[in-house]
Interface confidence: medium
Amino acid sequence: WGFKNGIFHNSIWLEQAAGVYHREARAGRYKLTYAEAKAVCEFEGGRLATYKQLEAARKIGFHVCAAGWMAKGRVGYPIVKPGPNCGFGKTGIIDYGIRLNRSERWDAYCYNPHAKECGGVFTDPKRIFKSPGFPNEYDDNQVCYWHIRLKYGQRIHLSFLDFDLEHDPGCLADYVEIYDSYDDVHGFVGRYCGDELPEDIISTGNVMTLKFLSDASVTAGGFQIKYVTVDPASKSSQAKNTSTTGNKKFLPGRFSHL
């Protein structure tokens, strides 16, 4: 742990580690019964993670603020960094125990050591994120999270260089979601699909999360998304609380980040 150059270090907030990854239903959070969670993992060539596998992943930085099914009907979630809104201020596996009612609805924690790894935590001042396999088409059943963590006081300017995801009403099939926060729970900015380049986005703080998800059928060309650091000195006049100036989307300052 600790700060270095104003950045909180350690590979926290990974969404996939040691073959363990978090899955939620396409309909959203906490929608999977035990049988459905098991089926989701198996469909992708994996299985429900054991408590030990989840703890091993947590030890190398796997942190998700969502309870999910594990093997043998257990429910819990891994916390690396304690926070007031997640994990009751504790670290470790927040364990709900083995559930008697297997029809309860939670997310899922899957284990698949052969799953394609993508995403991660990035502290560089600039970088380009690409969909897995770009410039080739991405695969079905992908889920990737890119977490950007810059120095306190800096902002993130996100721009879309290439963008071609499957078209589906409301982007229910394949999509990229952007969050103006450190996770995929708070600060939702938008969900994007299709082949139009979304407008640039400038964060309100020093963190941002990008999530890419593809479903089980039909793929497309993929994307390249670039971010650069906006230093406090060059923030220009961002008094405009909302909306769009040119092709840049300035986000209202609703979220404070450490």
């Epitope: 995801l165 589906d168 099939a173």
Partner: antibody, heavy 124, light 106 residues
């Protein structure tokens, strides 16, 4: 001419079931997402769900108000769209329209062709 | 879900008069679509992608707006324009319709 014609409406008791059909003609049915929309008497339109086209395996999505009670399916050999309605309630009384979903670039989906509608009344 | 509020609920206009109706979204949406429905008939696509007229729609109709505020305008009201107009979004799920603006001819 592109045409959608619904049938199967009528009077049904609360808790009962009904199946609506929508016969499509004038276009390649398998190439399109198809949807159901309803309109209670004197009220606004409400989207119920849609079913995807062949490339997406004909998977369906539903609105929260009907999920678990209504099922959308399609017979592609006959170009017919179905809406199976179970556990019907008084508030399900409405004119039911099938509509073709048209896509012309992200994120622009809209209902470009509408059927004539069929009326469902749920009452004891 | 995004709630679309149309105003006014009912309005009347004389032939030749300019008419504007609005559709306000509870959250920002990318585009708005509009449908025309005459009494006892099914809706018809009317304006899509905020401002594009569907085929067969007279040029006196126009659409505009962005974010949470959209409008449909008729530059010169004609008797055949009397109908109910519904706005609709699909920027986020589920797709939603407005409550409608009923336009009468004076």
């Amino acid at each position: 001419e592109v045409k959608l014609v619904e049938s199967g409406g009528g009077l049904v008791q609360p808790g009962g079931s009904l199946s609506l059909s929508c016969a499509a003609s004038g276009f390649t049915f398998t190439d399109y997402y198809m949807s159901w929309v309803r309109q209670p008497p004197g009220k606004a339109l409400e989207w119920l769900g849609f079913i995807r086209h062949k490339a997406k395996g004909y998977t369906a999505e539903y609105s929260a108000s009907v999920k678990g009670r209504f099922t959308i399916s399609r017979d592609n050999s006959q170009s017919i769209l179905y809406l199976q309605m179970n556990a019907l309630r008084a508030e399900d009384s409405a004119t039911y329209y099938c509509a073709r979903l048209y896509y012309y670039g992200s994120p622009h989906w809209y209902f470009d062709v509408w059927g004539t509608g069929t009326t469902v009344t749920v009452s004891s | 879900q995004i709630v679309l509020t149309q105003s006014p609920a009912i309005m009347s206009a004389s032939p030749g008069e300019k008419v504007t109706m609005t559709c306000s979204a509870s959250s920002s949406v990318s585009y708005m679509h509009w449908y025309q429905q005459k009494s006892g008939t099914s809706p018809k696509r009317w304006i899509y992608d905020t401002s594009k007229l569907a085929s067969g729609v007279p040029a006196r109709f126009s659409g505009s707006g962005s974010g949470t505020s959209y409008s449909l305008t008729i530059s010169s009201m004609e008797a055949e324009d009397a109908a109910t107009y519904y706005c609709q979004q699909w920027s986020s799920n589920p797709p939603t319709f407005g409550s409608g603006t009923e336009l009468e001819i004076k």
